[in-house]
């Protein structure tokens, strides 16, 4: 579908005569008839197969034709067609004299024809005008013509229908060949698909307008390429939505159970080795010279009371040295020159002769050790209590005082408040809003009834010369640990003075 346009520009009829040579009276009032038809090698009369058009009277004798496309569309003349433009044509332009106002063919005398021109040829669809001039003996006609496509028709033959669109189901304009040209941000056969934000995940993201990236359920991030983990997932990740795959060292449904307290909290101090021993629990193995739950306390090598039989300990750079009381010798004063006759066994230990009385051995009661039963057994040196529990010597055994939230012989079990039976020695546990309270039986006190309030044999300070006093809890007697330079059961003898044993 298109339009053949003919623009008449100038008609010259200087003598004002008809084709017959007869002059017009008073002048030739000129109008035109145009016939457009299919291509003929020799243009002959017959049906105007592509259309006809007539003009009103445009002037007298010689005149220029005004461009009147804005005021009624008479010039250029329009010859519309509703078919594919064939690319060739024949054109007949007749100039007629109108004696009166009736311009119908049947109302005009046959000799009213002024001139007739006929042309034929090829004509491609396009915006450019072709200028032509036809001259006869008495007249001259200057004109131009072109073929353009009707609105919404495109292509070389005006055969491609295309209607621009910009709504939900299409965002495009039409190219000269009739193909669609998508507006920026749109794609698809009819430019109805928005082009999402660059990088927006193909499966997990989508968009309803250009440069957008909306995430499907379970996905997040600017490009919808990050899965959303299970709600409440603390230390975990996901590879598909709603998963909770725990990071190393974490466990449980929500990855909120700490399986690697050592790594996450580094509780062990002074280069100690940390071992995970369950959820939120750990054990520190101290380097030599350190002690405490977290190996936070510096330890003198003499603190372990290595000197036996009342020997006094002296720290040295490369270790320690034991100064032995009279009658004892050896690295730890462990060898005796005494016999059972000298009653060398402390704390109720019983003496047994050896090597025909040249030597002896003490059999110690429970909770005491050493070659003379002079040392209380310390069962806490191996740090047996887990989860930061404090180790206590209790008579012939040891016990762990657990931190809040733990219970069990070695504080290895998790409990809360009274469920852990935190009160020692038969104490009664009471749940409080912010913790618990223990009501202790007679003979015990302390926050957890852990302190025995029976007679303390060390209360009377029986040890001399700043010696350390230890209570024998089974017999309510004491043992003195002598400082350097003193010996004796009460550390009452300076080294070098012979003791006069009272027994």
């Amino acid at each position: 579908s298109g339009v053949f346009q003919l623009q008449l520009q100038e008609f010259i009829n200087e003598r004002g005569v008809l084709a017959s040579g007869r002059p017009c009276e008073p002048g030739c009032r000129t109008f035109f008839r145009v016939c457009l038809k299919h291509f003929q090698a020799v243009v002959s009369p017959g049906p105007c197969t592509f259309g006809t058009v007539s003009t009103p009277v445009l002037g007298t004798n010689s005149f220029a034709v005004r461009d009147d496309s804005s005021g009624g569309g008479r010039n250029p003349l329009q010859l519309p067609f509703n078919f594919t433009w064939p690319g060739t044509f024949s054109l007949i332009i007749e100039a007629w004299h109108a004696p009166g106002d009736d311009l119908r063919p049947e109302a005009l005398p046959p000799d009213a024809l002024i001139s007739k021109i006929a042309i034929q040829g090829s004509l491609a669809v396009g915006q450019n005008w072709l200028l032509d001039e036809q001259t006869s003996t008495l007249t001259r006609l200057r004109y131009s013509y072109r073929v353009i496509c009707s609105d919404n028709y495109y292509g070389d033959n005006c055969s491609r229908l295309c209607k621009k669109r910009n709504d939900h189901f299409g965002h495009y304009v039409c190219q000269p060949d009739g193909n669609l040209s998508c507006l920026p941000g749109w794609t698809g056969e009819y430019c109805q698909q928005p082009i999402c934000l660059s990088g927006c995940h193909e499966q997990n993201g989508y968009c309803s307008k250009p440069a957008e990236c909306l995430c499907r359920p379970g996905w997040q991030g600017r490009l919808c390429n990050e899965c959303i983990p299970h709600n409440g997932c603390r230390h975990g990740t996901c590879s598909t939505p709603w998963q909770c795959t725990c990071d190393e060292g974490w466990g449980g449904l929500f990855c909120d159970q700490d399986l690697n307290y050592c790594t996450h909290h580094s509780p062990c101090k002074n280069g100690a080795t940390c071992s995970n021993s369950g959820q939120r629990s750990y054990t520190c193995t101290c380097r030599p010279g350190y002690t405490g739950v977290d190996c936070e306390l510096e330890l003198s090598e003499c603190d372990s009371n290595p000197c036996r039989n009342g020997g006094s300990c002296k720290d040295q750079e490369d270790g320690y040295h034991c100064l032995c009381p009279p009658g004892y010798y050896g690295l730890h004063c462990e060898h005796s020159t005494l016999s059972c006759a000298d009653s060398p066994c402390f704390n109720g230990g019983s003496c047994r002769e050896r090597n025909q009385g040249a030597n002896y051995a003490c059999e110690c009661p429970p909770n005491f050790t050493g070659s003379n039963c002079e040392k209380k057994v310390d069962r806490c040196t191996s740090n047996p209590c887990a989860n930061g529990g404090q180790c206590l010597n209790r008579g012939p055994s040891r016990m762990c005082r657990c931190r809040p939230g733990f219970t069990g012989t070695y504080c290895e079990l998790h409990v809360s408040d009274c469920a852990r039976n935190p009160c020692a020695h038969g104490g009664t546990c009471h749940d409080l809003e912010n913790g618990l309270m223990c009501t202790c039986p007679a003979g015990f006190s302390g926050r957890r009834c852990e302190v025995r309030t029976s007679i303390d044999a060390c209360a009377s300070s029986p040890c001399f010369n700043r010696a350390t006093c230890y209570t024998d809890l089974s017999t309510d007697t004491f043992v003195c640990n002598c400082p350097y330079g003193f010996v004796g059961s009460r550390c009452e003898f300076p080294v070098g003075l012979p003791p006069s044993f009272p027994w």
Epitope: D151, H168, F169, Y206, C207
Partner: antibody, heavy 122, light 107 residues
């Protein structure tokens, strides 16, 4: 051959939400050349477009119904659904599901369901 | 064209040509589709892109669209063509608009 089947409640009370499902059989709802539309026809009256959806989830609604309409797609079930809130007697109609995309044109309705009658009444 | 106007009814004798029109502002600038709906049935597409017929639609159905008017022409109308006919187009605010429908009666 592609077919569409509507399933609806038949009767809905005023001010409630109308829910209706369209099941696609004989083809995939995830076809990149198809949109899926909902059209209604009140008794004795003409056709009215409600809205359309693409398998990706992009939705397009009639301006006159936009505030009350929600259309969703479930590609795993090969179906799309309509929710129309705050219904009144004026929403009484036969509701049709249709495929859009004949000849590549995304707004040409070429395959229709048989329609389901929904009455709004207390 | 935010409104499409169709005459409510058209009557024609069998074998005659029926013309059903659809008018709207600058309707020629958009594509028009036509649907046939027989009583108690779902609509059927008979014309799309102004003039094109889907496969299976008889040649007697044709369409045109220019200016403000689109026309569905049924030449050699048959009794079986008796139905309601709806035109459909678009505008910039509403992606899909239907005309009010025309009832074709074949006398």
């Amino acid at each position: 051959q592609l077919q569409l089947q509507e399933s609806g409640p038949g009767l809905v009370k005023p001010s409630e939400t109308l829910s209706l499902s369209c099941t696609v059989s004989g083809g995939s709802i995830s076809s990149s050349s198809s949109y899926w539309g909902l059209i209604r026809q009140p008794p004795g009256k003409g056709l009215e477009w409600i809205g359309s959806i693409y398998y990706s989830g992009s939705t397009y609604y009639s301006p006159s119904l936009k505030s009350r309409v929600s259309i969703s797609v479930d590609t795993s079930k090969n179906q799309f659904s309509l929710k129309l809130s705050s219904v009144t007697a004026a929403d009484t109609a036969v509701y049709f599901c249709a495929r859009q995309g004949y000849g590549g044109h995304p707004d040409v309705f070429d395959i229709w369901g048989q329609g389901t009658m929904v009455t709004v009444s207390s | 064209s935010s409104e499409l106007t169709q005459s409510p009814s058209v009557s024609v004798s069998p074998g005659q040509t029926a013309r059903i029109t659809c008018s709207g502002d600058k309707l020629g600038d958009v594509y028009v589709r036509w649907y046939q709906q027989k009583t108690g049935q779902s609509p059927v597409l008979v014309i799309y892109e102004d003039t094109k017929r889907p496969s299976g639609i008889p040649e007697r159905f044709s369409g045109s669209n220019s200016g403000n008017t689109a026309t569905l022409t049924i030449s050699g109308t048959q009794v079986m063509d008796e139905a309601d006919y709806y035109c459909q187009a678009w505008d910039s605010t509403t992606a899909v608009i239907f005309g009010g429908g025309t009832k074709l009666t074949v006398l």
